[in-house]
């Protein structure tokens, strides 16, 4: 009989959703030059208010109005362009709001200019047919707001042309960003206008711009970077996974069982098995016998698949998720239908990835 | 048309060198980031080495780095793989290929040249 | 490094079926993500770019889908030179890691 037997309740007690630490897109407020722009903090229950913009703390002058929850600018100029955020500060916790405000005319090369991407490869412009900096990609440049978990990589994208070639230099919070401005320094690779950091830290926090200039002029983009530092939890299984089904004598089943763990997680397949005619050993444990597991030789381990099954093979199939803080399981019942019955749920048979890391 | 010829392969002892070389034509070379890539025999593909158009950024994978050393002569459309300490887990057939512009994928690969380390 | 997990490892499947092929990467990588299709003795040759861009002079049964950390390859209706493997790679990071590669076998 196999040394492991599971001794928990199955039950799983209720948790909260699963993260992978993505956040919406912040709202994109549209003004031209000149225009007044208002805004509403979208937070309720706000006591105190603070405004910041690209990260840095925004207080009232002769051109920002600020009121309870609104924010108004008056006449907008390209400077007013960027992340802002409304942070509400209460009793017990704050809660935080961004938008984006992009101040642009029509003819404006900034980022809603069309992605003019398409070429399959990169022609150089005509050395005459001198030109400003310019965005090439604005599709890759719309997620502004980079909510990742601390030990990721980042990348930050401003693809652009110019004639001559534009040059492109990265700052932090305003400041030139150099190597040794964070442990391990950074990537850039020019060819692809981007800036990597691997392994980012809740230092990395900040703003990141792109200037990118020739001698005909210069564009910038900021991007914001928050560090999501990892909160250790037991691994949550996807309710509902993994699922009853039936198939008949001969035929194949795959049962599906999604894992979300930050900590590597390690899965196992059981099943309840028979040992001399009995389900349960001398000391009142089940019989169990571990079908699958991950490791190395182990490839999708959140996939069980059956192939030409019999009678034998009918009854409940547990997926068991451990890692270092703590597991969980849940479990289906696999029916076994003599070949002349159809089944009530056909196989469905789709390539499942591996957990959620 | 592109192609990509690569060239130096061959049987070398462990802890041995070898230089692998890439001859490009059809296309402006010093346009284009390149890549080595090699496949074990009977194994999957596994990214060595890239280097930037104009030579100013190179990247290695862990299991190659302070071994290898990528290097490209635009002059001649020529890209290089300098190997030392090579080891067994290094045999292997070593491709050369182009990254398309503004994207990291590889659009023109070599035929591949085999790098056998055996004592 | 980035880790990129394919599945299934490999599949049987007969002309004309539609085959769907996936590939998990360890964290988000955006759309940074190529395909590629590999046979015998032969070097791999680009099908899909950056996730759902499809590689000149690739035939249109083969698209590439998602974004963020699942993606997946399909080809509408399997033809015999479809048979051969397929990789999936990240370029998100520095390291342009494949996944281990789907192995198409003819049912």
């Known amino acids: 009989r196999p040394s492991f037997s599971l001794v928990e309740d199955t039950t799983l007690e209720p948790e909260e959703p699963p993260t992978k630490y993505q956040i919406s897109q912040p709202e994109v407020y549209v003004a031209a030059p000149g225009e007044s722009l208002e805004v509403r903090c979208l937070l309720k229950d706000a006591a105190v208010i603070s405004w910041t913009k690209d990260g840095v703390h925004l207080g009232p002058n002769n051109r920002t109005v600020l009121i309870g929850e609104y924010l108004q600018i008056k006449g907008a100029t390209p400077r007013d362009s960027g992340l802002y955020a409304c942070t509400a500060s209460r009793t017990v916790d704050s809660e935080t709001w961004y938008f984006m405000v992009n101040v642009t005319d029509a003819i404006s090369s900034g980022d809603d200019e069309d992605d003019t991407d398409g070429a399959e490869d990169f022609v150089s412009e005509n050395s005459n047919n001198k030109r400003a900096p310019y965005w090439t990609n604005t599709e890759k440049m719309e997620k502004r707001l980079h909510a990742v978990p601390a030990a990721n990589t980042v990348k930050f994208r401003c693809p652009a042309g110019g004639n001559p070639m534009p040059t492109m230099r990265w700052l932090k919070n305003g400041k030139e960003f150099k190597q040794e401005h964070r442990i391990g320094g950074y990537k850039v690779r020019n060819q692809h206008w981007s800036l990597i950091m691997e392994s980012v830290v809740p230092s990395d926090k900040g703003n990141y711009t792109c200037v990118v200039e020739n001698e005909y002029g210069s564009i910038n983009h900021t991007y914001h970077l928050d560090v999501v530092e990892r909160s250790p939890h037991r691994p949550i299984l996807q309710a509902g996974l993994p699922a009853n089904a039936s198939t008949v004598v001969g035929g194949d089943v795959e049962f599906v069982c999604k894992v979300y763990s930050d900590a590597q997680p390690h899965i196992q397949w059981i099943k309840h098995v028979e040992k001399n005619g009995s389900k349960y050993g001398p000391d009142g444990l089940p019989y169990l016998k571990v079908l699958k597991h991950s490791g190395i030789n182990s490839s999708n381990a959140e996939v069980l698949a059956l192939f030409n099954v019999t009678e034998a093979d009918a009854g409940e199939y547990i997926c068991k998720v451990s890692n270092y803080i703590g597991q969980a399981n849940q479990s289906a019942w696999l029916t076994v239908l003599p070949k002349q019955q159809a089944p009530g749920r056909e196989k469905e048979i789709t390539a499942s990835p591996d957990y959620l890391e | 048309q592109v192609q990509l010829l690569e060239s130096g392969g061959g049987l070398v002892q462990p802890g041995g060198s070898l230089r692998l070389s890439c001859a490009a034509s059809g296309f402006t070379f010093s346009d284009y980031a390149m890549s080595w890539v090699r496949q074990a025999p009977g194994k999957g593909l596994e990214w060595v080495s890239v280097?930037?158009?104009?030579?100013?950024?190179?990247h290695y994978a862990d299991s190659v780095k302070g071994r290898f050393t990528i290097s490209r002569d635009n002059s001649k459309n020529t890209l290089y793989l300098q190997m030392n300490s090579l080891r067994a887990e290094d045999t292997a057939v070593y491709y050369c290929?182009?990254?398309?512009?503004?994207?990291?994928?590889?659009?023109?690969w070599g035929q591949g040249t085999l790098v056998t380390v055996s004592s | 490094d980035i880790q990129m997990t394919q599945s299934p490892s490999s599949l049987s499947a007969s002309v004309g079926d539609r085959v769907t092929i996936t590939c998990r990467a360890s964290?988000?990588?955006?759309?940074?993500l190529n395909w590629y299709q590999q046979k015998p003795g032969k070097a791999p040759k680009l099908l899909i770019y950056?996730?759902?861009n499809l590689q000149s002079g690739v035939p249109s049964r083969f698209s590439g889908s998602g974004s963020g950390t699942d993606f997946t390859l399909t080809i509408s209706s399997l033809q015999p030179e479809d048979f051969a493997v397929y990789y999936c790679q990240q370029h998100y990071s520095p390291s342009h890691t494949f996944g281990q590669g789907t192995k198409v076998e003819i049912k």
């Open positions: 964290q988000d990588i955006s759309s940074d």
């Open positions: 950056d996730a759902s």
């Open positions: 290929a182009r990254e398309k512009t503004y994207s990291s994928a590889f659009d023109y």
């Open positions: 280097i930037e158009g104009d030579g100013s950024y190179t």
